[in-house]
């Protein structure tokens, strides 16, 4: 039993973590600067997307890059519980807080803002430089999708790294996982062509859900054959003249559920991975 | 002046390095096993490529993956001169060998076989599982291209790492370079659409040369619209029905020089990077 409530402990851990973040701003500022620079570089490379066959390639390419970049940059989240492992064990044994207070406190103060920022920055810079679909809902769906990808990738990092003493093994394991997830994301291979005994692996791929959602959000209602009334006069089975045709060829469901089921899947993955991370911290205290 | 000739010293360094390689076979065997497993996984995912629009996507995807994989796995070459830095300085000062003997000896015994093997393994496994272009020249061109990519990426790693004491900074720098090179390789962005003030960066991209050569080698003379009389029923203006159309849309020169200029560029990069690495070792000896 603890003298202080869960909420008090949560506030205290969050406050301290947030102070550490502000007290050592180099890392956070560096991350923001790197994100802004990368956003501007990507914006410059893909500036002003065309509505022709190159527009399909470039849209798919940039959405793939943003998704995989969110995943690989989330590898750094392995440090969250590893770096402070000894301090956590000492403070937990000393009765400072519950495991749950520490766990959610660190998530709220550290993981939540540091994974939210890149998504916001990338979307704000890239969206307008590229000239993606000019609707407010599409803009915010993209931002939300990138956040969800970052959170699920970070949650996976925590699930792998929680309770470990060294970062390197967890980082290597994460990188290998993301490489395979990247293959199954839907750009490097058309997911409809994979043999059934292998295709189930796509459902464990974080970037696949993110990439599918971003493509659904961006391609729906677009035309890619300039000068051709593609919806009326497309007698050619082999041309990809509309966003819907492109999505169908990629095996993406065109209904609203075809978009939102990706976020549901990512949310489920976040819950599962955070549960694993929490259980590993609980398991750790028993052996401390 | 040395009592032994350059050739004698070269033989001696090569022999010792090769003995070290054979005496500690775990690393080499592990690399071979990983390559074989990855080759089989890629072969299974892309098994039996179709000659339709998915065939274009899957061919481009697998060739991109193989190219970038060769690059990123070459990052480990940073260790070649870093790990033995102290031993090199000690032995050089003691008059055991010339810098050139050590440099070329290490390249011949270590870099040459360890970078050649993955290219051979990948090509032998992937080529037949995927059903790539069934001609002997295309098979060997693919193998040669993957080797050239591996050698140029490894040479870049040596140029960055030579003379350094720690691997981590060089590894980070290499990874960042390869991420940007990967963007400019030609899958994630159509290189014909990049603004002229930025597009010159593509000429510094190792994977761009490898990927272009592999695509030229594979796509030339392929058809992707089965059953369509393309020359008669040409409502398919927007379809990509031939490999040549695909290559043209990617901005790839269809002539034989369009293939071989990539290998020439990679060879130039290898020479430049190895020269830098050699000069850094020479420079190092002056300050030892």
């Amino acid at each position: 039993s603890y003298t202080t409530s869960f909420c008090h402990q949560l506030r205290w851990v969050s406050k301290r973590s947030f102070k550490n973040l502000l007290g050592n701003p180099q890392a956070s500022i560096a991350q923001i600067i790197v994100t802004v620079i990368l956003g501007l570089v990507i914006g410059a490379i893909y500036f002003g997307l065309n509505n022709d066959s190159t527009g399909i390639q470039n849209r798919a390419g940039v959405l793939f890059f943003l998704t995989t970049n969110q995943c690989f940059s989330s590898v750094s989240a392995v440090e969250l519980f590893v770096v402070e492992k000894k301090l956590f064990i000492h403070e937990y044994i000393s009765g400072y807080y519950r495991v749950s207070s520490y766990f959610f406190g660190k998530l709220l103060s550290d993981l939540l803002p540091m994974r939210m920022l890149p998504s916001i920055i990338f979307t704000c810079i890239v969206y307008f430089m590229l000239g993606l679909k000019p609707t407010a809902d599409a803009f915010f769906i993209m931002m939300f999708t990138l956040m969800m990808v970052a959170y699920s990738a970070s949650s996976m990092a925590l699930a792998i790294a929680a309770g470990q003493s060294v970062v390197s093994v967890a980082t290597l394991l994460m990188t290998i996982c993301f490489v395979f997830m990247m293959i199954f994301s839907g750009l490097l291979v058309n997911l409809t062509t994979i043999a059934s005994w292998l295709s189930w692996l796509q459902y464990f791929s974080i970037p696949r859900y993110g990439f599918t959602a971003l493509q659904h959000n961006e391609f729906l209602g677009q035309n890619f054959c300039p000068g051709l009334n593609a919806t009326v006069n497309n007698t050619c089975n082999y041309a990809t003249c509309t966003g819907e045709e492109y999505l169908t060829k990629q095996g993406i469901d065109l209904s609203p559920w075809g978009l939102w089921k990706n976020h549901v899947a990512l949310a489920c993955m976040i819950v599962i991975f955070l549960t694993i991370a929490y259980l590993k911290l609980l398991f750790l205290k028993k052996y401390s | 002046s040395y009592t032994t000739s350059f050739c004698h010293q070269l033989r001696w360094v090569s022999k010792r390095s090769f003995k070290n390689l054979l005496g500690n076979p775990q690393a080499s065997i592990a690399q071979i096993i990983v390559t074989v497993i990855l080759g089989l996984v890629i072969g299974a995912i892309y098994f039996g490529l179709n000659n339709d629009s998915t065939g274009i996507q899957n061919r481009a995807g697998v060739l991109f993956f193989l190219t970038t994989n060769q690059c990123f796995s070459s990052v480990s070459a940073v260790e070649l001169f870093v790990v033995e830095k102290k031993l090199f300085i000690h032995e050089y000062i003691s008059g055991y060998y010339r810098v050139s003997s050590y440099f070329f000896g290490k390249l011949l015994s270590d870099l040459l076989p360890m970078r050649m093997l993955p290219s051979i393994i990948f090509t032998c496994i992937v080529y037949f599982m995927l059903g790539l272009k069934p001609t002997a020249d295309a098979f060997f061109i693919m193998m040669f291209t993957l080797m050239m990519v591996a050698y140029s990426a490894s040479s870049m790693a040596l140029a960055i790492a030579a003379g350094q004491s720690v691997v981590s900074v060089a590894t980070l720098l290499m990874t960042i370079c390869f991420v940007f090179m990967m963007i400019f390789s030609g899958l994630l962005v159509n290189l014909t659409t990049i603004a002229s003030w930025l597009s010159w960066l593509q000429y510094f991209s190792i994977p761009r040369y490898g990927f272009t050569a592999l695509q030229h080698n594979e796509f030339l003379g392929q058809n992707f619209c089965p059953g369509l009389n393309a020359t008669v029923n040409n409502t398919c203006n927007y379809a990509t029905c031939t490999g040549e159309e695909y290559l043209t849309k990617q901005g790839i020169d269809l002539s034989p020089w369009g293939l071989w200029k990539n290998h020439v560029a990679l060879a130039c990069m290898i020479v430049i990077f190895l020269t830098i690495a050699y000069l850094k070792l020479l420079f190092l000896k002056k300050y030892s």
Epitope: - | A230, E244, L254
Partner: antibody, heavy 119, light 102 residues
């Protein structure tokens, strides 16, 4: 749908200048990699490639006729032109225009226009 | 150099036309069919790749300087002129082969 149509004077006198027009639709000569070529075929004889013009205005000519030929384009009107000054009877032929990629055989041809050089 | 200039065949015969270049042309060879009063039609590109719509009785092969074109089972609709084309360095047509019925 890709279509090409050649037009010319039909009959013209020796030493005059032959001007040919190729009007096309279904593609644009501003698209990366797209070119238009002129090919001719004297009656009962074989095909001879003459000249080529590409999207970025690069031009190529048959080396044996290079100093006699001039190819140009009007992208806004989807037209390509060929000029041959001081013609003689050897220039009598069916003249074809064809759409092509930068380095590719000719898949799409016009139906041809007959030019007769006669005094 | 395209040979022979003319060729007589019976229906169902196999015929072969050859083209020899003055230097290595890296398989950059195409074959055309031309019927009287019509524009040429592309049958084969890159030595052996059949264009969409080309019947499978047509085939091409070769490398370096020597290339050949075959019709395995001549039909009446195949009676036409045939041309080879090199496109490795600009474009050059062969002299043509006239295929006639015996």
């Amino acid at each position: 749908q890709v279509t090409l149509k050649e037009s010319g004077p039909g009959i013209l006198r020796p030493s005059h200048t032959l001007s040919l027009t190729c009007s096309f639709s279904g593609f644009s000569l501003t698209t990366y990699g797209i070119c238009v070529s002129w090919i001719r075929q004297p009656s009962g004889k074989g095909l001879e490639w003459l000249a080529n013009i590409c999207w970025e205005d690069s031009k190529a000519y048959n080396p044996s006729l290079k100093n006699r030929l001039t190819i140009s384009k009007d992208t806004s009107n989807n037209q390509v032109f060929l000029r041959i000054p001081s013609v003689d009877t050897a220039d009598s032929a069916i003249y074809y225009c064809a759409r092509v990629f930068n380095n590719y055989p000719f898949p799409y041809w016009g139906q041809g226009t007959l030019v007769t050089v006669s005094s | 150099t395209q040979s022979p200039p003319s060729l007589s065949a019976s229906l169902g015969d196999k015929v072969t036309i050859t083209c020899q270049a003055s230097q290595n042309i890296n398989k950059y060879v195409a074959w055309y069919q031309q019927k009287p009063g019509k524009a040429p039609r592309l049958l084969i590109r890159y030595t052996s790749t059949l264009e969409s719509g080309t019947p499978s009785r047509f085939s091409g092969s070769g490398s370096w300087r020597d290339y050949s074109f075959s019709i395995s089972n001549v039909e009446s609709e195949d009676i036409a002129d045939y041309y080879c084309l090199q496109y490795v360095n600009l474009w050059t047509f062969g002299g043509g082969t006239k295929l006639e019925l015996k």
